[in-house]
Amino acid sequence: VAKKKDKVKKGGPGSECAEWAWGPCTPSSKDCGVGFREGTCGAQTQRIRCRVPCNWKKEFGADCKYKFENWGACDGGTGTKVRQGTLKKARYNAQCQETIRVTKPCTPKTKAKAKAKKGKGKD
């Protein structure tokens, strides 16, 4: 049986914590009901019981939904390309970033193209 609070203080006795940063409530089974939320503050961590309301209409899977731009050009130096996402919708209690950057490796084709472009520029 899960305890109401599984508290692990890593900062040692008497270490004061001003502000805790809490992750999302993760239900123990299915997508709602009782679960746990991890919190961190400095070197301290804390795990508390929480509940995702089952009357939340889970029409979208993730806590944070983003609208993405098209992928940027392949960076020959890093072999990756980047795109930016702007927050479109968040679950009410989800502390989502307003914008995110996603990188992914270039496909062999685009890698070759980027390298060829780089080579031409040096001539």
Epitope: W22, C50, N55, W56, K89, Q95, C96
Partner: antibody, heavy 117, light 107 residues
């Protein structure tokens, strides 16, 4: 930062529906939940419901299911709440507020609704 | 619906005093508890979100604590501008609900 503009006052006759507006300016209106809250004279705060402008998903307090209808107009960055068949009991200040769990919320100044013949 | 009980109903203090306001939930709400201040004829202002997270622009004398069913708002060394109503609100389940409020007044 988001600014929410609401008309200062509205007067409506009993039984005549009224549509309250909440116009957003500043940061993206469409990314955040818009709440509507009622405060009767000298009373506390009562949550009516909320709507998400991106897809108009609405979660309504069951107490207001036959009273309030929430809508948004993305083109004008405006949220609306229509109150049907108002009575003197509906005379109150109505606030809109834009909520983000990350940054907190922003509130309109409130619209004082008077239901009187 | 989750009921939030605030105590005391009224708190009479002198500027410079430090105070604690309490909010108790009828069932566990994890840390989904927020504190608002409201002055007469004004809209509410968010002071603390998610039980203990500070809000940009809010003086550091305001702090929050608690989880589960018991929560506290502390005001360290009250200033005259702090007088008004204080409401707690839960966002753990629908409908969102508010406490009846604590009035912080001048002694």
């Amino acid at each position: 930062q988001v600014q929410l503009q609401q008309p200062g006052a509205e007067l409506v006759r009993p039984g005549h529906s009224v549509k309250l507006s909440c116009k957003a300016s500043g940061q993206s209106f469409s990314s955040y939940w818009m709440n509507w809250v009622r405060q009767r004279p000298g009373q506390g705060l009562e949550w009516i419901g909320m709507i998400h402008p991106s897809d108009s998903e609405t979660i309504l307090n069951q107490k207001f299911k036959d009273k309030a209808t929430l809508t948004v107009d993305i083109s004008s960055n405006t949220a609306y709440m229509q109150l049907s068949s108002p009575t003197s009991e509906d005379s109150a200040v109505y606030f809109c507020s834009s909520w983000s769990a990350k940054r907190g919320d922003f509130w309109g100044q409130g619209t004082t609704l008077t239901v009187s013949s | 619906d989750i009921v939030l009980t605030q105590s005391p109903a009224t708190l009479s203090v002198t500027p410079g005093d430090s105070v604690n306001l309490s909010c108790r939930a009828s069932e566990s709400i994890s840390n989904n508890l927020h504190w608002y201040q409201q002055k007469s004829h004004e809209s509410p202002r968010l002071l603390i979100k998610y039980a203990s997270q500070s809000i940009s622009g809010i003086p550091s004398r305001f702090s929050g604590s608690g989880s589960g069913t018991d929560f506290n708002l502390s005001v360290n060394s009250v200033e005259t501008e702090d007088f008004g109503m204080y409401f707690c609100q839960q966002s753990n389940s629908w409908p969102l609900t508010f406490g009846a409020g604590t009035k912080l007044e001048l002694k």
